[in-house]
């Protein structure tokens, strides 16, 4: 019985991508339910690692070092077989991050996309990485891997994601690896949130006291909907940052958020979106654009009384 039937399944939790100093549990599952297993690291010529020790249920590895990176397999205990052990499991690659300078991650055409569109996530660095890896937070699957292209002293890889569906929204990071150490990855890039819009009904956006105001007059933009959105996001054309506020239920059974913009100094076109707490990176259709005009003495910047969120953090829950 050396076929798939006899083959255990090796998995890692919480992830196969582990930072230096982190811990990872290797679990050897077998349909016949053995508890005892042996671990092998493939770059050690299939010799059992950890001095041939036998483990029960799971083995916790850590604090991990670059030397822990590599391909692992397990064999389960089968007392009545000729060898006493099952066939080797699937290969499991453990990648250890934090070994080189972080690359940069960009989204083309941008991180805010409509359902069904395709986005290119470009990972690049001035370190000559041979491979780039793209990982979405919260999924246990192995990261996508691409060979780096080197041009003008920069190595880069373009990951195509799409057509976009809610399941693909989330926080992405990329890593690089150098030749001869394929599973010793760099520090992660800064996180990049990919937001998918157009999934739910659009909210309405209005301005108080109105869309045309005197310079210096206080302006508040209100985003509301009959849909029970948890969060509203307000964006201004030409600005990378969005602001977000928790939706508040109103007596007229709408859900609303009021964004105070402070004293008006110059105009702009605003849009708002709604989202639910369970899927913070999946937004509604955009509200109709609202043009705020300022009469009087416009200046070059509008003060921001609510701190705008960074390019990342959109996909975190708002507490």
């Amino acid at each position: 019985l050396m076929g798939g039937q006899d083959k255990p399944f090796l998995s890692a939790r919480p992830s196969t991508v582990v930072p230096r100093g982190g811990h990872v549990a290797l679990q050897c599952h077998y349909r016949r339910g053995f508890n005892n297993f042996m671990l092998y690291k493939e770059d050690r010529s299939h010799v059992p690692i950890f001095h041939g020790r036998i483990f029960q249920e799971s083995f916790i590895m850590g604090p991990v070092t670059p030397a822990h990176a590599g391909t692992y397999r397990c064999r389960g205990s089968r007392p009545h077989s000729l060898t006493g052990w099952s066939a080797p499991s699937n290969p499991l690659v453990i990648m250890v991050t934090g070994n080189h300078r972080k690359p940069s991650l960009l989204a083309h055409p941008g991180p805010l996309l409509k359902s069904g569109e395709t986005v290119i996530l470009q990972c690049w660095s001035d370190v000559m990485f041979e491979h780039f890896f793209l990982h979405r937070e919260g999924i246990s699957e192995d990261p996508s891997r691409l060979v780096g292209q080197i041009h003008d002293g920069v190595s880069k890889a373009n990951f195509s994601i799409g057509p976009l569906m809610p399941v693909l929204a989330g926080t992405y990071r990329c890593y690089g690896s150098v030749p001869h150490s394929p599973y010793q990855l760099s520090a992660p890039s800064d996180p990049l949130d990919i937001v998918i819009t157009g999934l739910y009904e659009k909210p309405s956006l209005s301005a108080q006291p109105g869309p045309t105001v005197q310079a210096g007059e206080n302006v508040t933009l209100s985003c509301s909907s009959w849909s029970s959105y948890d969060i509203y996001h307000l964006s201004r054309e030409g600005e990378a940052h969005e602001r977000r506020l928790r939706a508040v239920p109103k007596v007229n059974r709408t859900f609303q958020a009021d964004f105070p913009l402070g004293p008006a100094t110059h105009g702009g076109t605003y849009r708002c979106f709604g989202s639910f707490r369970a899927l913070p990176c999946v937004w509604s259709n955009s509200s109709d654009p609202l043009l705020v005009s300022v009469t009087g003495n416009p200046s070059s910047s509008w003060p921001s009384p609510t701190e705008p969120s960074s390019k990342s953090g959109i996909c975190r829950h708002l507490h």
Epitope: R20, G21, G22, H23
Partner: antibody, heavy 120, light 107 residues
């Protein structure tokens, strides 16, 4: 029972070095990593780095990379941390702490702390 | 590096009250979080590990909760001996950074 006993307080001049010790008892010294944490007067806690006594592998917080050297003597179950080129900013209490076992381990035992004062 | 943002930095409460301290990680730390209590001139002592598990000998009025990036330490029915400084710390990769601390003072 598990105990981590650190060496006594030290007063050093700027530019000097100091070696702080942490003697472990009540467990198998080589089975756990030993970590060092610093606390400047009136400040919070900062992780410095760790040593795996069984292999000698060390890892440092980048902030302290050129400041500290961690070693371990398995025959006496003692971990050491040497601080070099001392400056007044290095005045702090230095703790050793054992990292526990498990998938989500904490620092389960701490030394009593060693006060290092750098003053001319 | 993962940043740990602890709030509030100080807190006044009375004996018998319930207090909550929060810690936010700059990225998912998969419950690799511990809470410590430190009294003046003493080493920190472990209260909670793995975000929710109470360390041996810690009174049940202490509890930890949270997952992902957001974690909470709650102390029910404050006792006089609970007035101290509390720190969170993550273990999801080096450097194992601490939160800035919360000083719990008697009102």
């Amino acid at each position: 029972q598990v105990q981590l006993v650190q060496s006594g307080a030290e007063v050093k001049k700027p530019g000097a070095s100091v070696k702080v010790s942490c003697k472990a008892s009540g467990y198998t010294f080589t089975s756990y990593t030993m970590h060092w944490v610093r606390q400047a007067p009136g400040q919070g806690l900062e992780w410095i780095g760790y040593i795996n006594p069984s292999s000698g592998y060390t890892e440092n917080n980048r902030k302290f990379k050129d400041k500290t050297t961690m070693t371990a003597d398995t025959s006496t179950s003692t971990a050491y941390m040497e601080l070099s080129s001392l400056r007044s900013e290095d005045t702090a209490v230095y703790y050793c702490a054992r990292l526990g076992k498990g998938l989500l381990p904490p620092f389960d035992y701490w030394g009593q702390g060693t006060t290092v004062t750098v003053s001319s | 590096d993962i940043q740990m943002t602890q709030s509030p930095s100080s807190l006044s409460a009375s004996v018998g009250e319930t207090v909550t301290i929060t810690c936010r990680a700059s990225e998912n730390i998969y419950s690799n979080l511990a809470w410590y209590q430190q009294k003046q001139g003493k080493a920190p002592q472990l209260l909670v590990y793995a975000a929710t598990n109470l360390a041996d000998g810690v009174p049940s009025r202490f509890s930890g909760s949270g997952s992902g990036t957001q974690y909470t330490l709650t102390i029910n029915s404050l006792q006089p001996e609970d007035f101290a400084t509390y720190y969170c710390q993550h273990f999801w990769g080096t450097p194992y950074t601490f939160g800035g601390g919360t000083k719990l003072e008697i009102k």
